[in-house]
Structures are given as structure tokens and as C-alpha cells.
């Protein structure tokens, strides 16, 4: 059914914002890229580049597209069925306990430690003790300072993607 063609299926020049396409819900739900009307009779398409829905839903409104912060790069734009994908700029990473901002990666390891993992958008550089090979976690002293933290503490991996 033509009403179910979502705007990301169209060429950029065909993506007009004005009228939103409508179709009928299936068992009370609307397909990705749409939201349901107040009376539950229609599925209304999300606005390309502005909002989206990813699943079959009975949402009254589509969800607002994420806008990448400064310090982030846009990996893929928002479509009616998929949110924007943002990633930390090179040299910065997003930490699990502070996902709202990109933090600068350390430039080197503390004395007595050696780098075994590079800076990625999801994790800081990884340092291990030269002798024991134990990962270092927690607050890191400046590169030239001596490490005083206990070597037995495991590092917390970072798996968050922007």
C-alpha cells in the first residue's frame, strides 16, 4: 500500500515535509516510521529528519531525533525508522558512567605501565602493569607520576556506542 512507503524510501528531492502519509493500524499498532492517531484509526508517518519510531507501536507522537553534540560526529542521519547515530570524535570516548558526554582519551600511561589498547570512541587507552600485566582502572595519575593504586583491581570495560 502506497501510504506505507516511509520517507526514507524516497530520494532526497522527494522528501517533502508537508503532508504526512496515513494508513490503517494493524491490530491497534502502527508500523515503524509511523505513530497512531488520537482516535486510533490512522497511522501517521513520522517527519523525516525530525522524528522517528523504530518498532510497531501505538505511540501518539513519534520520538524526536537525537542531535549530535559538539564533540561528536554523525555516523548516520535520522530517518523515520531509525534514530541518528552519533559517535565521539577521534581522541575522545564515551564512558559508561557518563554517557552524556565525550571525554578526552589519556595521551599515555602512568609510569610502570604499558599501553595495550588504543583510544576508541567507546574506550580510553588501556594500560597494564609492566610486570604483572594487570589492567589499571580508576583515577589515573599524570603520566610522569608514580602509580600507587592496587594492581589487583579489574578495569571496567566500556561497551557503549554513541
Amino acid at each position: 500500500e502506497s501510504a506505507l512507503i516511509t520517507q526514507q524510501d524516497l530520494a532526497p528531492q522527494q522528501r517533502a515535509a508537508p503532508q504526512q502519509k496515513r494508513s490503517s493500524p494493524s491490530e491497534g499498532l502502527c508500523p515503524p516510521g509511523h505513530h497512531i492517531s488520537e482516535d486510533g484509526r490512522d497511522c501517521i508517518s513520522c517527519k523525516y529528519g525530525q522524528d522517528y519510531s523504530t518498532h510497531w507501536n501505538d505511540l501518539l507522537f513519534c520520538l524526536r531525533c537525537t542531535r549530535c553534540d559538539s564533540g561528536e560526529v554523525e555516523l548516520s542521519p535520522c530517518t523515520t525508522t531509525r534514530n541518528t547515530v552519533c559517535q565521539c570524535e577521534e581522541g575522545t570516548f564515551r564512558e559508561e558512567d557518563s554517557p552524556e558526554m565525550c571525554r578526552k582519551c589519556r595521551t599515555g600511561c602512568p609510569r610502570g605501565m604499558v599501553k595495550v589498547g588504543d583510544c576508541t570512541p567507546w574506550s580510553d587507552i588501556e594500560c597494564v602493569h609492566k610486570e604483572s600485566g594487570t589492567k589499571h582502572s580508576g583515577e589515573v595519575p599524570a603520566v610522569e607520576e608514580t602509580v600507587t593504586s592496587s594492581p589487583g583491581t579489574p578495569a571496567s570495560p566500556c561497551s557503549l556506542s554513541g
Epitope: 491497534g28 505513530h35 497512531i36 488520537e38 486510533g40 525530525q50 522524528d51 507501536n57 501505538d58 505511540l59 501518539l60 507522537f61 513519534c62 520520538l63 524526536r64 537525537t66 552524556e100
Partner: nanobody, 127 residues
Framework: EVQLLESGGGLVQPGGSLRLSCAAS????????MSWFRQAPGKGLEFVSA????????VYADSVKGRFTISRDNSKNTLYLQMNSLRAEDTAVYYC????????????????????WGQGTLVTVSS
């Protein structure tokens, strides 16, 4: 984290008007859909109206259609409820609420989807 603070409640005569405001603070408050609910004395929470993040899509409970108007000003991070032709049965504490969106079940009082609530403002309609 979004904080919501309502204001504008008070005593008004039947047939009168009142405008409620809800100031939102916190990161990305304008990304949220916003809603008004109310709780009359001795009753449960009732859906009043909702508005999408951009302010162009609105939904109303049948009991307030044609009398109440919801709007928002994202530059001020503020939600409004213009209430006209007020009736005694509109007497309640009015709460604003925020969520990324609302499912249709919110119209029937499903509140599990609400992420943030305000403290409420009392509206009394009496002569």
C-alpha cells in the same frame, strides 16, 4: 534528568479562564513529549492533554476538548495549558508530565510510561 515546576493555579469562577505553566529544566527538556494530568479531590489521576516535542501535534481528553488548549515554547522550556469556560468539575490539582512519547493507553490512565512529574498546582472553580 528533567525537573518540572507548575504554576498559575488559583481560585476562579465558573465560566472563567486560567493559564497554567510548567517550567522544565534539565538536559534536553525540549526532546520530550509533555502532558497535563489532573486529580480531583478523592479521585484518581486523569489525562487532560498532551503535546509532542515540536508542539505541532496535540491530544485532548473528551472532557476538555474545545475548552482547553495545550501549547509549548521550547525556547523558554515551558509548557502551557490555557483553560477557558471552566466548570466546577475542573477543580483539581493539575500536574505536568514528560516522556519521550505517550502510547494511546495514556488516554485511559496508564501512567507507567511517564518519566518525570511535576509537583502540581491547585485549580479551584467555585462561585
Amino acid at each position: 534528568e528533567v525537573q518540572l515546576l507548575e504554576s498559575g493555579g488559583g481560585l476562579v469562577q465558573p465560566g472563567g479562564s486560567l493559564r497554567l505553566s510548567c517550567a522544565a529544566s534539565g538536559r534536553a527538556a525540549s526532546d520530550y513529549a509533555m502532558s497535563w494530568f489532573r486529580q480531583a479531590p478523592g479521585k484518581g489521576l486523569e489525562f487532560v492533554s498532551a503535546i509532542n516535542w515540536g508542539g505541532e501535534d496535540t491530544v485532548y481528553a473528551d472532557s476538555v476538548k474545545g475548552r482547553f488548549t495545550i501549547s509549548r515554547d521550547n525556547s523558554k522550556n515551558t509548557l502551557y495549558l490555557q483553560m477557558n469556560s471552566l466548570r466546577a468539575e475542573d477543580t483539581a490539582v493539575y500536574y505536568c508530565a514528560a516522556a519521550p512519547s505517550f502510547s494511546r493507553s495514556v488516554l485511559d490512565g496508564n501512567l507507567s510510561q511517564i518519566d518525570y512529574w511535576g509537583q502540581g498546582t491547585l485549580v479551584t472553580v467555585s462561585s
